[in-house]
Interface confidence: low
């Protein structure tokens, strides 16, 4: 049922009133305000912005707005001892040094506290040695190097291009390969779209531009020193040696001008195929080491960054629900940026600000949502999702009992082509129905629905006439809510055309050139895409907080469970002989999925027919819907990843950004042919199948008739 059935409001305060109140001009104004100076986590500037947002949210009409602080491990370059990489000759003389900073964009030359490019949480060190080019440093790239090409990275400095996977996975892979250091660079093949000028004349990355970013492998732990618990005043903190997820080798990022100087001298093996070659004018030889005349030259890294416990601040705003104040719908996005944050995060923060303003306007006119809405401005997302994770750790008991949904609100745009949505299957129908009611901002779709342009530009690979919705992975603040706590989650933003723009992320991601002007000049001059994203995010929050019956459809979970079971079965069937030898069967899992499908179907019928005016019955049915996501949580977590507890979805072990289905089974099967003890390996596959079977069956039973 739609939100207009909520009993606590006058008819005019419906979804349409909320959406009509959202204004593109306001989002533009807020974005400009949030991007004039850097707001790096742990700095005074970001604390001041937190206080400004607190003040404005109060003005907008929220019931309460609080700052919550935590003392977490952050990482910064040494201001007097800069990080760089050099080529040294046989005498140890530095004959080439990488740049110490990005040339600031016009108009920003006198801005102070622009942090130079660095890899956050890199240890200090000055390794030197031969270079090995490892492509994207993915698992498969190291397989190619080590297994096919017989190239040993042990004792070598590896150079990897950014893109395809989360940088932390690249560093982990390099460590496992025995590398002594990692150089990350942006190749024009991935960060320079053909036919577009580089900033400030276009949205492409200039040669001096560099992507900052953390290189942690936290696996959902939050603050590396206080895994599982909030980093508050009385927290026990681990020593640095026991900290979670810190890299053990120095890492540093560079732009493609500097990369050219390192890569042009590379010798050794040729690249195995064209997928290893970018578009610099260099050989893309793998190495190890430099060629011929340059073979006596080495590469040396000079990394002097420090990690220190630093105070961070979240802003938490509350709009109390009129009917079910103990049910929370959360809208959250981060506030901290690497530099100006023109896209990441402030294009998202500006949208959240306007959504808060619209909700506040309705509240000032006497309206309240049915359920409580919490708004969050997270700190230290760029340092490992720290603000959101610490807050969720502190409030975990409340959240697991009261959390209805979490909607993420980082960057509103990564392109201006079409909508992109990742969410729990429970929200599929909500998103479809909402986008059918919204107007498309796309050229050529005037007067058409957002659903129509989205479906045309990003069709579902499985169902014709429907748009693609992707799995949730990680790399953003929904992680703790979805992967750890099992709260139904979703995210939406405008994206690029993935067919024609093959580069990873947007070219200026995490660089100094990610400015207000980038957005205003090149991505969204009319701020119409920002407005659409505000309508989608805000509309989802409105429905989740205001619908009499929660807008979740458990039948969509049944459909994907069958799809994921088929997928993992097909992966396992690549080893038919071993499955026979070790008696590996997926029959139990398919049976559980069948049971889930039947029970979900019956539940949906009861949901349609029950007496909505009976508050006890209504609450009971809503609780079954709310707790369904929670039912997929295994309290023991995934193997070696205790904070990834969702049995159906987890971030890929090979790419934090990507979601993997039935991750426990998937990881048990991965590269199983190379395992030393096949009996043990297939035993683990069987164990994971049994866990998945139990979890699906148990989740199904939460939907059964209560008595």
């Amino acid at each position: 049922k739609s939100s207009s059935e909520a009993t606590n409001i006058t008819p005019k305060h419906n979804m349409k009133a909320f959406l009509d109140e959202l204004k593109a001009e306001n989002i533009k104004k807020f974005l400009h305000n949030f991007t004039q100076i850097p707001h790096l986590a742990g700095t005074e500037q970001n604390f001041q912005l937190a206080k400004q947002i607190q003040s404005q949210w109060k003005e907008f009409g929220l019931d309460s707005v609080e700052l919550t602080h935590y003392d977490v491990l952050l990482s910064y370059p040494n201001k007097t001892h800069p990080n760089y990489i050099s080529i040294i000759n046989e005498d140890g003389n530095e004959i080439f040094n990488t740049s110490l900073f990005e040339p600031p964009p016009a108009g920003y030359e006198n801005v102070s506290d622009i942090v130079p490019p660095f890899s956050a949480f890199s240890p200090q060190g000055m390794p030197e040695g031969d270079l090995v080019y490892v492509n994207y440093a993915r698992t498969e790239d190291f397989f190619k190097l080590e297994r096919d090409m017989k190239i040993n990275c042990s004792g070598k400095i590896v150079i990897a291009r950014y893109g395809k996977v989360f940088r932390g996975n690249k560093v982990k892979n390099a460590q496992l390969a025995g590398a002594t250091g990692v150089i990350l660079y942006s190749d024009p093949a991935d960060y320079f779209a053909p036919g577009v000028k580089s900033y400030p004349d276009g949205w492409n990355l200039p040669g001096g531009g560099v992507q900052r970013g953390n290189i942690l492998n936290l696996n959902g732990a939050g603050d590396p020193l206080t895994p599982g618990y909030p980093a508050n005043e009385y927290a026990y903190r681990r020593g640095i040696a026991e900290a979670v997820g810190l890299p053990s080798i120095p890492v540093h990022p560079i732009g493609y001008y500097d990369a050219q100087k390192l890569l042009e001298k590379m010798g050794g093996s040729a690249s195995p195929d064209s997928s290893w070659r970018g578009s610099l004018k260099v050989p893309y030889n793998v190495g190890p080491g430099f060629t011929g005349n340059f073979s006596t030259q080495k590469v040396k890294m000079h990394i002097h960054s420090t990690s220190e416990v630093t105070r961070i601040y979240n802003v938490i705003g509350t709009l109390r629900g009129a009917v079910e104040p103990d049910r929370y719908v959360i809208l959250g996005g981060h506030r901290d940026s690497w530099v100006f944050g023109g896209i990441d995060p402030q294009s998202g923060a500006a949208v959240v600000h306007e959504i808060v303003r619209s909700f506040g306007t309705l509240k000032k006119e006497g309206w309240r949502p049915r359920r409580t809405i919490l708004f969050a401005s997270w700190d230290a997302e760029e340092f490992g999702l720290l603000g959101s994770t610490e807050w969720a750790e502190e409030n975990s008991r409340l959240l697991q009992e009261r959390g209805v949904a979490y909607i993420n609100a980082d960057s509103s745009i990564e392109g201006n082509y079409t909508l992109r949505v990742d969410c729990t299957p429970l929200m599929y129908s909500l998103v479809y129905n909402l986008t059918k009611e919204l107007e498309s901002p796309d050229e050529g779709f005037e007067g058409k629905s957002l659903y129509e342009s989205w479906t045309k530009k990003s069709p579902s690979p499985e169902f014709s006439g429907m748009p693609r919705i992707s799995k949730l992975g990680s790399g953003n603040d929904f992680e703790v809510f979805f992967q750890r706590l099992g709260i139904a989650s979703g995210r939406a933003r405008y994206t690029k055309n993935w067919e024609t723009n093959k580069f990873s992320s947007y070219p200026l991601y995490h660089s100094v050139y990610e400015t207000y002007e980038l957005v205003e000049k090149f991505y969204d001059p009319m701020f119409k895409y920002h407005l659409t994203v505000a309508q989608v995010r805000g509309g989802m929050v409105f429905e989740l907080a205001n619908s009499v019956v929660l807008p979740f459809d458990c039948r969509d979970y049944a459909v994907v469970l069958r799809k994921y079971a088929d997928k993992i079965y097909n992966i396992s069937m690549k080893h038919p002989q071993e499955m026979k030898t070790y008696s590996v069967s997926f029959d139990s899992l398919f049976s559980a999925v069948k049971n889930f499908t039947e029970i979900a179907s019956k539940f949906s019928e009861r949901l349609r027919d029950f007496d909505k005016s009976n508050p006890i019955l209504l609450r009971m049915m809503n609780d079954q819907l709310m707790f369904l996501e929670r039912a997929f949580i295994d309290p023991l977590g995934l193997p070696d990843r205790p904070f990834y507890r969702h049995v159906i979805y987890a971030p890929s072990s090979h790419n934090k950004y990507a979601g993997e289905s039935f991750p426990g089974i998937y990881d048990a099967l991965f590269d199983i042919e190379s395992k030393v003890d096949p009996s043990q390996a297939w035993g683990e596959v069987k164990r994971q199948i049994s866990i998945a079977t139990f979890t699906v069956q148990a989740a199904a039973e939460t939907l059964s008739e209560v008595a």
Epitope: G268, S269, P272, N285, S295
Partner: antibody
Framework: QVQLKESGPGLVAPSQSLSITCTVS????????ISWVRQPPGKGLEWLGV???????HYNSALKSRLSISKDNSKSQVFLKMNSLQTDDTARYYC??????????????????WGQGTSVTVSS | DIQMTQTTSSLSASLGDRVTISCRAS??????LNWYQQKPDGTVKLLIY???RLQSGVPSRFSGSGSGTDYSLSISNLEQEDIATYFC?????????FGGGTKLEI
């Protein structure tokens, strides 16, 4: 100037092994990869494998189990060893140097210098 | 493995003619296509690399073109010394593979 010269046994009995040496001059094996290619009588060229500057190798998948390529940088020699020869291994065997093309936008695997080849007959 | 197909195994032409030899790959090879000339005495020479780049010392009457899976070698103003067999080879993905060859006769 750049030269590559193959030397082999000429005649090999079936099921026996073949060893061919490629001796190079005018360049160093530390800077250039070497490929082996063969051509059966009246047929086309078949790529056998490559040894990279660092000593890593890649082989034609159909011959992988029988083929081994090694080298001695100091002697400027590359060695091809093939086991279990059959009559259809009768061919002219070439070694070829990979070109190093710098200063252009991409990198290309092309063999820009070839030996004159050595003829191998497998017969009892 | 990527299969390289030269559909024409032999080709007759007159001196001064322009001839074109074609080559098809079983999958997209991203322009990593080389052409070799093998003289009747067995000597092999690289003519063109990366679809259209002329190897130094090769006469400009040789040219190459193509993209994706379809490539061709053209010889304008055919000369007696061009009598040879021509092979295409993909340098995109290991293992590298050759086409079957096209024998050019006068």
């Amino acid at each position: 100037q750049v030269q590559l010269k193959e030397s082999g046994p000429g005649l090999v009995a079936p099921s026996q092994s073949l060893s061919i040496t490629c001796t190079v001059s005018g360049f160093s094996l530390t800077n250039y990869a070497i490929s082996w290619v063969r051509q059966p009588p009246g047929k086309g060229l078949e790529w056998l494998g490559v040894i990279w500057t660092g000593g890593g190798t890649h082989y034609n998948s159909a011959l992988k189990s029988r083929l081994s390529i090694s080298k001695d940088n100091s002697k400027s020699q590359v060695f091809l060893k093939m086991n279990s020869l059959q009559t259809d291994d009768t061919a002219r065997y070439y070694c070829a140097r990979k070109g190093n093309y710098y200063g252009s936008s991409l990198y290309y695997y092309a063999m820009n210098y070839w030996g004159q080849g050595t003829s191998v007959t497998v017969s009892s | 493995d990527i299969q390289m197909t030269q559909t024409t195994s032999s080709l007759s032409a007159s001196l001064g003619d322009r001839v074109t030899i074609s080559c098809r790959a079983s999958q997209d090879i991203s322009n990593y296509l080389n052409w070799y000339q093998q003289k009747p005495d067995g000597t092999v020479k690289l003519l063109i690399y990366y679809t259209s780049r002329l190897q130094s010392g090769v006469p400009s009457r040789f040219s190459g073109s193509g993209s994706g899976t379809d490539y061709s070698l053209s010889i304008s103003n055919l000369e007696q010394e061009d009598i040879a067999t021509y092979f295409c080879q993909q340098g995109d993905t290991l293992p590298y593979t050759f086409g079957g060859g096209t024998k050019l006769e006068i």
